[in-house]
């Protein structure tokens, strides 16, 4: 399973749309601040 790649400090809004985000990756925290904290990898249903 590939988990989320946190090597980059920049994130792009998933829902904004290409003409609005203009492919830019903003230097900001993930939308849910706890996402950046170390945790056990999630197990998604499609992997079971």
């Amino acid at each position: 399973m590939e988990d989320f790649n946190m090597e980059s400090d920049s994130f792009e809004d998933f829902w904004k749309g290409e003409d609005l985000s203009n492919y830019s990756y903003s230097s900001t925290l993930p939308p849910f601040l706890l996402d950046a904290a170390p945790c056990e990898p999630e197990s998604l249903e499609i992997n079971k």
């Epitope: 989320f4 090597e7 994130f11 809004d13 829902w15 904004k16 939308p31 996402d35």
Partner: antibody, heavy 120, light 116 residues
Framework: QVQLVQSGAEVKKPGSSVKVSCKAS????????ISWVRQAPGQGPEWMGW????????NYAQKFQGRVTMTRDTSISTAYMELSRLRPDDTAVYYC?????????????WGQGTLVTVSS | QAVLTQPSSLSASPGASVSLTCTLR?????????IYWYQQKPGSPPQFLLR?????????GSGVPSRFSGSRDASANAGILLISGLRSEDEADYYC?????????FGGGTQLTVLG
Amino acid sequence: QVQLVQSGAEVKKPGSSVKVSCKASGGTLSSYAISWVRQAPGQGPEWMGWINPNSGGTNYAQKFQGRVTMTRDTSISTAYMELSRLRPDDTAVYYCASGYCSRFNCKDYWGQGTLVTVSS
Amino acid sequence: QAVLTQPSSLSASPGASVSLTCTLRSGINVGAYRIYWYQQKPGSPPQFLLRYKSDSDKQQGSGVPSRFSGSRDASANAGILLISGLRSEDEADYYCAIWHSSAWVFGGGTQLTVLG
């Protein structure tokens, strides 16, 4: 684990309004858009619009302009979607969703869905 | 004509590779769009699998196995979701989506049945 938790099922009369809530449980909403997507029985998803939790700015799908209002209360990490002048064909499961992408991966979050039934 | 057209159903055997297509309406060039792919199982919300525009502009969903991959067929003006090593748990509905004219547009979906 971060989750989007939605309010419970609603049964509404035609012509009335419904307000669905979406709370970020275990995390804090940031500047990324929260979209609302509905899915009628046996149909594909239909995007209704999004709200920026930081600014409160909205972008509504043309189909729902004038009938939908998206708001948020950052103090309780909750977004709301209100749909007015309900019709029977508004019967659907309503989802909130958010997410972000790095250069290599994307992470999406969806609420569990809220069934809204419009019936006389 | 719909913006995005998907075959309504598809069936294949475990272990096989399947290609799910998402054809863009004439006049809308697939090369200009990121094609998003979602998997949905009964009673659950859609789950993002991946998005694909080109080999240099593609993102996988977090935790989504690499046997789910994207491509495009320029001659058919279509986006493609390739699932290799098909498993029984891949049986689901699959939807494509694009950001078009300042709105998210979803295809009608393909119901994938895993035989046996």
